[in-house]
């Protein structure tokens, strides 16, 4: 239970204004009414409260809104957003992109990735899906934030908005997120010509299956090493030396540089050494000539 202090009559608060910056923590607790604070939230960000004072104001709002703040309050949080935890944000229902923009601006330059990820998640839930307007807002105000969404949330992305996603927006996406986004991108760009298609699909290829990589290898795409290194290990391993050579084109020489890194290292271990030798790169670690390759995983599955 909170320790109670009576508000001195001369300190009574009838509206939220700059005089509150001179209130001690105890005085704020005793004199600022949470309902009044919520009603006049639009004034709070213009007042230079200390972090300790902001803590008190946050606790006041928590008292008033135990089930989570309404959007009318969230919209005006300003620097008070910096005091919010992911658990606080998880209780919110946010539908307005103006609210999202305002809070993304506040969070810039602060270590708030978990809070921002949760906020974006609440916006997607509130709006029903990650629509084009939301995606545009994210790309404009928070590049890379798209990847903070869970694969489950990303599954609501309509293919039509994939075109608005820029390569840098996907930089921090993990394999599970690209697994969700790649099929949507494939659908979105299906009517494009070979070279144009590859430029568009390239940032999403971390979610591509082996079959699609094989198909790309037939199209003279000259994949750069950075893109190749982001491919799913499981998708790369079944590719033959010839297919990788065609896929990379002139960039195949980069394999030597990445020889010790996954997925290149794992792929080398799966290739016959004499096939690797045809590349003339001096790649080592392939299966020696004359060895028989047994796929034990198949045998285990049968037994």
């Amino acid at each position: 239970d909170v320790e109670r202090t009576t508000c001195p009559p001369e300190k009574e608060v009838h509206e939220i204004d700059e005089s509150l910056i001179f209130y001690k923590k105890r005085e704020l607790e005793a004199c600022v009414d949470a309902a009044l604070l919520a009603a006049q939230m639009d004034r709070v960000d213009a007042i230079p409260f200390t972090y300790e004072q902001l803590d008190v104001l946050k606790h006041k709002l928590d008292e008033l809104y135990p089930q989570g703040y309404p959007e009318s309050v969230i919209r005006h949080l300003g620097h008070l957003f910096l005091k919010m935890s992911p658990e606080d944000i998880r209780k919110w229902n946010v539908t307005s992109l103006e609210t999202l923009k305002a809070l993304l601006k506040v969070s810039k330059g602060h270590e708030m990735s978990a809070q921002v990820a949760t906020l974006i998640d609440r916006v997607v839930v509130g709006r029903g899906q990650l629509d084009k307007d939301t995606a545009d807002t994210l790309t404009a105000f928070c590049p890379g934030c798209l990847c903070s969404l869970s694969p489950e949330r990303l599954s609501s992305v309509p293919p039509s908005i994939i075109g608005a996603v820029r390569p840098q927006d996907l930089d921090t996406c993990g394999p599970r997120q690209l697994d969700v986004l790649y099929p949507k991108a494939r659908l979105a760009f299906q009517n494009m010509s070979g070279s144009e298609y590859f430029v568009k699909i390239r940032p999403f290829l971390g979610g591509a299956p082996t079959e699609d990589l094989k198909a790309l290898s037939q199209q003279n795409v000259s994949m750069d090493l950075a893109t190749f290194m982001k491919l799913r290990r499981e998708a790369v391993l079944p590719l033959s030396v010839a297919e990788v050579q065609k896929l990379l084109g002139p960039h195949v020489e980069g394999l030597k540089v990445e020889e010790q890194h996954s997925p290149v290292r794992d792929w080398i271990l799966k290739q016959r050494q004499d096939d690797l030798d045809t590349l003339g790169l001096g790649l080592q670690g392939g299966i020696p000539n004359g060895y028989l390759i047994l796929d034990l995983s198949v045998r285990e599955a049968l037994s």
Partner: antibody, heavy 119, light 108 residues
């Protein structure tokens, strides 16, 4: 079902004291702002006071400031209004009401208890 | 304090007619904190509208609220016999919280 039941009203002489109680049930009282509102016979509604759930921050109408004290006992789900130095103009039906912070309105009211200040 | 002035004081109408009640604030208030109540003789008030335009639980859709800043309106599209009562507006944007003086809607 939300219920608010006021008690403690009655006839009191000017300058006297009275304590009103409001027993709450059907909702999480410990999370909820509560208010007192009064209505003089044949007149309109007048907000008297409210109290926050955790910090018990209080606010009063100027007409009762320094004479009335609102309080709550969260363990008993009960709201109180201690009325001292009563005046004839305090004669009214006193309602206990729940303030819905998500709506900014008083969404549930008790049936009221009549306080008559007269000699 | 914020003074809320309701007009007219009394509205004499017949069932089925439209009622328009006005509430004017002496200072601009946030519409999120403007509510309307209905009170019948011998009963406690009942919340009708909150946030200037949102109907409270169980309130029929013939009741609607609108307005912003200093001017707010409660409209009853078609009066039913049970709608004849006193209506109050209330603001909780500033302390003290204040009510209007009320508008009585009576049968003509």
């Amino acid at each position: 079902e939300v219920q608010l039941l006021e008690s403690g009203g009655g006839l009191v002489q000017p300058g006297g004291s009275l304590r009103l109680s409001c027993a709450a049930s059907g909702f999480t009282f410990t999370n909820t702002y509560m208010s007192w509102v009064r209505q003089a016979p044949g007149k309109g509604l007048e907000w008297v006071s409210n109290i926050s759930p955790t910090y018990s921050t209080t606010n009063y109408a100027d007409s009762v400031k320094g004479r009335f004290t609102i309080s709550r006992d969260n363990s008993k789900n009960t709201l109180y209004l201690q009325m001292n130095s009563l005046r004839a103009e305090d004669t009214a039906v006193y309602y206990c009401a729940r303030y819905n912070s998500y709506q900014g309105g008083l969404d549930y009211w008790g049936q009221g208890t009549l306080v008559t200040v007269s000699s | 304090e914020i003074v809320l002035t309701q007009s007219p004081g009394t509205l004499s109408l017949s069932p089925g007619e439209r009622a328009t009640l006005s509430c004017r604030a002496s200072q601009s208030v946030s519409s999120s904190y403007l509510a309307w109540y209905q009170q019948k003789p011998g009963q406690a008030p009942r919340l009708l509208i909150y946030g200037a335009s949102s109907r409270a639980t169980g309130i029929p859709d013939r009741f609607s609220g609108s307005g912003s800043g200093t001017d707010f309106t409660l409209t009853i599209s078609r009066l039913e016999p049970e709608d004849f009562a006193v209506y109050y507006c209330q603001q909780s944007y500033y302390y003290p919280i204040t009510f209007g003086q009320g508008t009585k809607v009576e049968i003509k």
